[in-house]
Interface confidence: medium
């Protein structure tokens, strides 16, 4: 008789999840010499220990603490790039601008990027069939709690001028319900962070509107100002040219507005 299994609304654990995490860890520690001391088997054991045998709607930040410890890493606090709903461009940018970091450029973010995982209460099995959906099932699921934990701590680590890349093609350029809007904004530390600078990325070739005047950007400015952090905003009208000029800043066409 097949054992009854909880059916969740979200997709199941990513195929070959243990192998993927382990392989990513090994790759990351090879590329980043300052992390070569990391024992990837211990990292996997800590990752697994955060959610295996636990009810996937009852995960806490504390469950991830052993993993957090193993992922301890120096991040230049004045070189942090946050993003919301525009991950690919943010990552392309930090691949070119090597001294800036998104969360996914850190070991912990790199390990989990684009992956899904969950277990089952009281069994050592990984659930490859389905995992809880944040909206339809529960918010305290393994993936959501992981990202909330690392995002909060990443924002807490930021200092001086913090940059955030926002998607100007979306109806809500700043979304209070995104990880940036609900976690990172509220965990920037006013004692350390002087300015939050938003880069609003335009989608359309002919779009010359000033999206920094968008009501949701004004809402972000209000939230940030109330936290005693200065706010500034820039339109990035041509993201392709923007990236090109980051690669080749001496190019004569890069003196004009991007």
């Amino acid at each position: 008789v097949p054992r009854w299994r909880q059916q969740w609304s979200g997709p199941g654990t990513t195929k070959r999840f243990p192998e993927t995490v382990l392989a990513r860890c090994v790759k990351y520690t090879e590329i980043h010499p300052e992390m070569r001391h990391v024992d990837c088997q211990s990292v996997w054991d800590a990752f697994k220990g955060a959610f295996i045998s636990k009810h996937p709607c009852n995960i806490t930040e504390e469950d991830y603490q052993p993993l957090m410890k193993l992922g301890t890493q120096t991040v230049p606090c004045n070189k942090i790039l946050l993003w919301s709903r525009i991950k690919d461009l943010a990552h392309q940018f930090t691949q070119v601008q090597r001294d800036m970091f998104t969360l996914e450029d850190t070991l912990l973010g790199y390990l989990a990027d684009d992956l899904t995982w969950c277990g089952e209460f009281n069994t050592s099995k990984i659930n490859y069939q389905s995992c809880p959906d944040w909206r339809k099932d529960c918010s305290n699921n393994p993936v959501s709690v992981f990202w909330k934990t690392v995002s909060r701590r990443f924002a807490e680590a930021a200092c001086d001028v913090v940059h955030v890349m926002l998607n100007g093609s979306r109806s809500k350029i700043f979304d209070k319900n995104s990880t940036f809007g609900s976690v990172e904004v509220h965990n920037l530390q006013p004692e350390k962070v002087q300015t939050l600078e938003a880069w609003v990325i335009h989608g359309g070739r002919e779009d010359s509107r000033d999206l920094c005047q968008d009501p949701t950007i004004k809402e972000l400015e209000s939230i940030i100002s109330k936290r005693n952090i200065q706010f500034s905003c820039k339109n990035i009208y041509r993201p392709d040219k923007f990236l090109q000029c980051v690669k080749n800043p001496e190019d004569s066409s890069c003196t004009s507005e991007i």
């Epitope: 957090m68 890493q73 120096t74 991040v75 530390q189 004692e191």
Partner: nanobody, 119 residues
């Protein structure tokens, strides 16, 4: 502006002890986790220990566990690292660093203090 100033380094024989201090200013010291990290000549920076804002959560790197003790005095805005049973491989510049809670991300903000273990 966030500032940390490390002191207490020096030359010590193997098996000896030292106490490092880190004076912090420009932020509410009692609200932040603090780290010690070190960098040996020609090597990458290595994390040593972390203490949470209230002193209740402490972690050490395996290489120093049982020999080093991290502590803090929030009334003096000062972080400490007691180094016992020192070995030659502990020779490094020691930095105190402002953390986020109890990690995992931190930033080196000080000039460091040099610890040399040699006979």
């Amino acid at each position: 502006e966030v500032q940390v100033l490390e002191s207490g380094g020096g030359l010590v024989q193997p098996g000896g002890s030292l106490r490092l201090s880190c004076a912090a200013s420009g932020f509410t010291f009692s609200s932040y986790g603090m780290h010690w990290v070190r960098q040996a000549p020609g090597k990458e920076r290595e994390w040593v220990a972390v203490i949470s804002y209230d002193g209740n959560t402490i972690y050490y790197a395996d290489s120093v566990k049982g020999r080093f003790t991290i502590s803090r005095d929030n009334s003096k805005n000062t972080l400490y690292l007691q180094l016992n049973s020192l070995k030659s491989e502990d020779t490094a510049v020691y930095y105190c660093a402002l953390g986020a809670g109890s990690g995992p991300f931190f930033d080196n903000r000080g000039q460091g203090t040099l610890v040399t273990v040699s006979s």
